[in-house]
């Protein structure tokens, strides 16, 4: 059946996929093109209640922090 990820398994998957970047449970503010404040879609809605692929998981990774110049 569809690959769903919930609870601790979802957290493990996010931690693994996102590595040191960390992750959000909701998409970061400003994600996408909509200006109106629609209800935020979260990773639980997308991956626990529906099938979830790696690219969708990656959308919830935090951006890489820029390295400081010497």
């Amino acid at each position: 059946g569809p690959e769903t990820l919930c609870g601790a398994e979802l957290v493990d998957a996010l931690q693994f996929v996102c590595g040191p970047r960390g992750f959000y449970f909701n998409k970061p503010t400003g994600y996408g093109s909509s200006i109106r404040r629609a209800p935020q879609t979260g990773i639980v809605d997308e991956c626990c209640f529906r099938s979830c692929d790696l690219r969708r998981l990656e959308m919830y990774c935090a951006p890489l922090k820029p390295t400081k110049a010497a």
Epitope: P2, D12, F16, G19, S51, D53, L54, C61, L64
Partner: antibody, heavy 123, light 107 residues
Framework: QLQLQESGPGLVKPSETLSLTCTVS??????????WGWIRQPPGKGLAWIGG???????YYNPSLRSRVTMSVDTSKNQFSLKLSSVTAADTAVYYC???????????????WGRGTLVTVSS | DIQMTQSPSSVSASVGDRVTITCRAS??????LAWYQQRPGKAPKLLIY???SLQSGVPSRFSGSGSGTDFTLTISSLQPEDFATYYC?????????FGPGTKVDIK
């Protein structure tokens, strides 16, 4: 160039814990784009993914083995390890360690493999 | 889990032949598919990734195509070193899964 080498006992008794180590040479295990995985292949059969680990220590295991698998990484030794508990004859296989490219490359394939080590579970 | 199937399970061919192997996923995986070659007693070797991208150092006689659920590996002119078993792998979702393999042997 980067090379991977598995090591560990070739014979494990039923109900005991299988322990393997993969040594990474010719490069650092700490590279941010590299993930590290274990795949096994029972004699004469196909390949099965066991799980993977990132240098930070975060892991993801195949749900079919999750209750028995533990992976760890030792960045100071450039090694990562696999432990599989409560083994049975069904765990007899060639065990491979492999490099997997992750998020920064946008794909999740195994582009570099160790030679593999045969582990037999028998009393 | 996403189940991967391959056909045929084995194929007998001669040097110079064109060989085609198919891989099917139990549900759509976009183009997140790889092909590996495994010679007897050796580790698998990555040939193709993202369904059609040739891995560095792999001869151009190997090519891949497909998306969604159906994929193909083609060897345009079989060479002696190509007699091996070929596996597909989906990289769309956890857990990563492989096909059962297709053995290419000498006719």
């Amino acid at each position: 160039q980067l090379q991977l080498q598995e090591s560990g006992p070739g014979l494990v008794k039923p109900s005991e814990t299988l322990s393997l180590t993969c040594t990474v040479s010719g490069g650092s295990i700490n590279s941010s784009s590299n993930y590290w995985g274990w795949i096994r292949q029972p004699p004469g059969k196909g390949l099965a993914w066991i799980g993977g680990i990132y240098y930070s220590g975060s892991t993801y295991y195949n749900p079919s083995l999750r209750s028995r698998v533990t992976m760890s990484v030792d960045t100071s030794k450039n090694q990562f390890s696999l432990k599989l508990s409560s083994v049975t004859a069904a765990d007899t296989a060639v065990y491979y360690c492999a490099r997997q490219r992750g998020h920064s490359s946008g794909w999740w394939y195994f582009d570099l493999w160790g030679r593999g080590t045969l582990v037999t579970v028998s009393s | 889990d996403i189940q991967m199937t391959q056909s045929p399970s084995s194929v007998s061919a001669s040097v110079g032949d064109r060989v085609t192997i198919t891989c099917r996923a139990s549900r759509g995986i976009s183009s997140w598919l790889a092909w590996y070659q495994q010679r007897p007693g050796k580790a698998p070797k990555l040939l193709i990734y993202t369904a059609s991208s040739l891995q560095s150092g792999v001869p151009s006689r190997f090519s891949g195509s497909g998306s969604g659920t159906d994929f193909t590996l083609t060897i345009s002119s079989l060479q002696p070193e190509d007699f091996a078993t070929y596996y597909c792998q989906q990289a769309n979702s956890f857990p990563f899964t492989f096909g059962p393999g297709t053995k290419v042997d000498i006719k």
